[in-house]
């Protein structure tokens, strides 16, 4: 998977009036990494692993960048014309990626009340707008404002692309993220299901990177997909991931079943506890 940095900013309006403050989160390689603390005007690391990425850095640049982006987004929301009564949100998601072949990608997406209405490839500066008439109207509104704003020139988009990649590279250079492997802890549990059946659950936790194979086997053969239930691979807040797989089996046949795990070239099997 490519390394990625993802900025997620949200601003709100109430009855057409843009609210002060904004919400901001940054994800690094899919993990919650930074959160903007509005009360203290500070970018705060999310968990120990995030602190480890930049050691004793003050996060002053991240703080200022997020604050500037938040102000920009509030100004953009103020220029959306069709704001009805009640609560509305404008969200900007900006992502940059560095792939294994060192190629890069950057994009920016705008959502109004949770609906995507404008995207831009920051490398080619190509805009795309969904087909709906609402999206078209919103996109025209925002693009007109961005054109008027002197900051949103060609060089500005190039800088957004370059800055995102520069930050991503800086985080990767810390060595905490780059090419690290944390093997999963695997735990198998059982619980009573319907009469004569039990549910067995295999949990893998605290692993990195996120790619993992976790499946139930019967007599050494993987069960079919439709007889197993999988959980999503989710960040656990410590810079690592967690997931699970469960299946229902007949009581008394536990010894025939094992949980098979494969991660970063290593694999293991785990029996059902008796």
């Amino acid at each position: 998977e490519p390394h990625s940095l993802r900025y997620n900013l949200t601003v709100l309006s109430w009855d057409g009036s843009v609210q002060s403050g904004f919400l901001a989160e940054v994800h690094l390689d899919g993990q919650p990494f930074l959160r903007y603390d509005r009360q203290k005007c500070r970018a705060k690391p999310q968990g120990q692993w995030a602190e480890d990425v930049l050691g004793n850095k003050t996060w002053d640049r991240e703080t200022r960048d997020l604050t500037g982006n938040g102000k920009d987004l509030r100004m953009t929301l103020a220029h959306i014309k069709d704001q009805k009564e009640g609560l509305h949100s404008l969200q900007e998601i900006r992502v940059c990626e560095i792939h294994e072949d060192n190629s890069t990608r950057s994009s920016q997406h705008f959502y109004y009340d949770g609906e995507l209405f404008l995207s831009q490839n920051l490398e080619t500066e190509e805009w795309t707008v969904p087909q709906s008439s609402r999206a078209q109207t919103l996109a025209m509104n925002v693009r007109n404002f961005l054109k008027e704003d002197a900051m949103k020139t060609k060089t500005h988009y190039h800088a957004m692309h370059a800055d995102c990649l520069q930050e991503l590279r800086r985080y990767l250079e810390s060595g905490v993220v780059l090419r690290r492997t944390v093997p999963p802890m695997v735990n198998v549990t059982r619980s009573e299901a319907s009469e004569g059946n039990i549910t067995v659950t295999c949990r893998a936790s605290s692993f990195y990177p996120r790619n993992i194979i976790l499946t139930w086997r019967q007599d050494g053969v993987s069960l079919s997909h439709d007889t197993q239930q999988w959980g999503d691979v989710l960040p656990d807040g410590n810079g690592t991931y967690q997931t699970w797989v469960a299946t229902r089996i007949c009581r008394g046949e536990e010894q025939r079943f094992t949980c098979y795990m494969e991660h970063s070239g290593n694999h293991s099997t785990h029996p059902v506890p008796s």
Epitope: K40, N56, K57, T58, D60, T67
Partner: antibody
Framework: QVQLQQSGADLVRPGASVRLSCRAS????????MNWVKQRPGQGLEWIGM????????RLNQKFKDKATLTVDKSSNTAYMQLSSPTSEDSAIYYC??????????WGQGTSVTVSS | DILLTQSPAILSVSPGERVSFSCRAS??????IHWYQQSTNGSPRLLIK???ESISGIPSRFSGSGSGTDFTLTINSVESEDVADYYC?????????FGAGTKLELK
């Protein structure tokens, strides 16, 4: 306008703790970090630490962790710094300064502390 | 801790001259440098933030430049009221640190 009013000069005995105050006005006290900075006579500036009045979160320079205690009183918009077991090394002017994105944009007039027996 | 080295310790110039103060960081701090002026018996005053950003109320003759490890504060036409000590401060790494200062004198 933003003002930081610091307490008057203090003459303290070695070993007797001293508490300096910094009263803020002209802005929302609980929205900004407050820094404390030391300046010995004829010397440069040294950052002691900062405190956020909203919940008293503190970030201290490790050099001062056993020397300085930062507190605030939100009801009076006042920040305090207590210096424990002062010695002649602690004789200095101490400034409070409002934080703006890690810069210090407004400064108090300073409090002179002299440690002498 | 980041060490900030300011040079020279004393600068002596004539009114109307252009003068530059140097601040060198012991490691890359990107643009996280700020400049302060402290007149005799006065409190420090913020002049420039983040290497080159101007501060409202500060005369336009003050400007800043640099990134990485080398930074410069420039006064493009010195006036008598500029006689003071000048300090740089970094905000990239805890703890925040200041340079030892450069004293500006008039010839």
């Amino acid at each position: 306008q933003v003002q930081l009013q610091q307490s008057g000069a203090d003459l303290v005995r070695p070993g007797a703790s001293v508490r300096l105050s910094c009263r803020a006005s002209g802005y929302s006290f609980t929205n900004y970090w407050m820094n404390w900075v030391k300046q010995r006579p004829g010397q440069g500036l040294e950052w002691i630490g900062m405190i956020h009045p909203s919940d008293s979160e503190t970030r201290l320079n490790q050099k001062f962790k056993d020397k300085a205690t930062l507190t605030v009183d939100k009801s009076s918009n006042t920040a305090y710094m207590q210096l424990s077991s002062p010695t002649s090394e602690d004789s200095a002017i101490y400034y409070c300064a409002r934080d703006d994105f890690f810069t210090m944009d407004y400064w108090g007039q300073g409090t002179s502390v002299t440690v002498s027996s | 801790d980041i060490l900030l080295t300011q040079s020279p310790a004393i600068l002596s110039v004539s009114p109307g001259e252009r003068v530059s103060f140097s601040c060198r960081a012991s490691q890359n701090i990107v643009t996280s440098i700020h400049w302060y002026q402290q007149s005799t018996n006065g409190s420090p005053r913020l002049l420039i933030k983040y290497a080159s950003e101007s501060i409202s109320g500060i005369p336009s003759r003050f400007s800043g430049s640099g990134s990485g490890t080398d930074f410069t504060l420039t006064i493009n036409s010195v006036e008598s009221e500029d006689v003071a000590d000048y300090y740089c401060q970094q905000s990239n790494i805890w703890p925040l640190t200041f340079g030892a200062g450069t004293k500006l004198e008039l010839k």
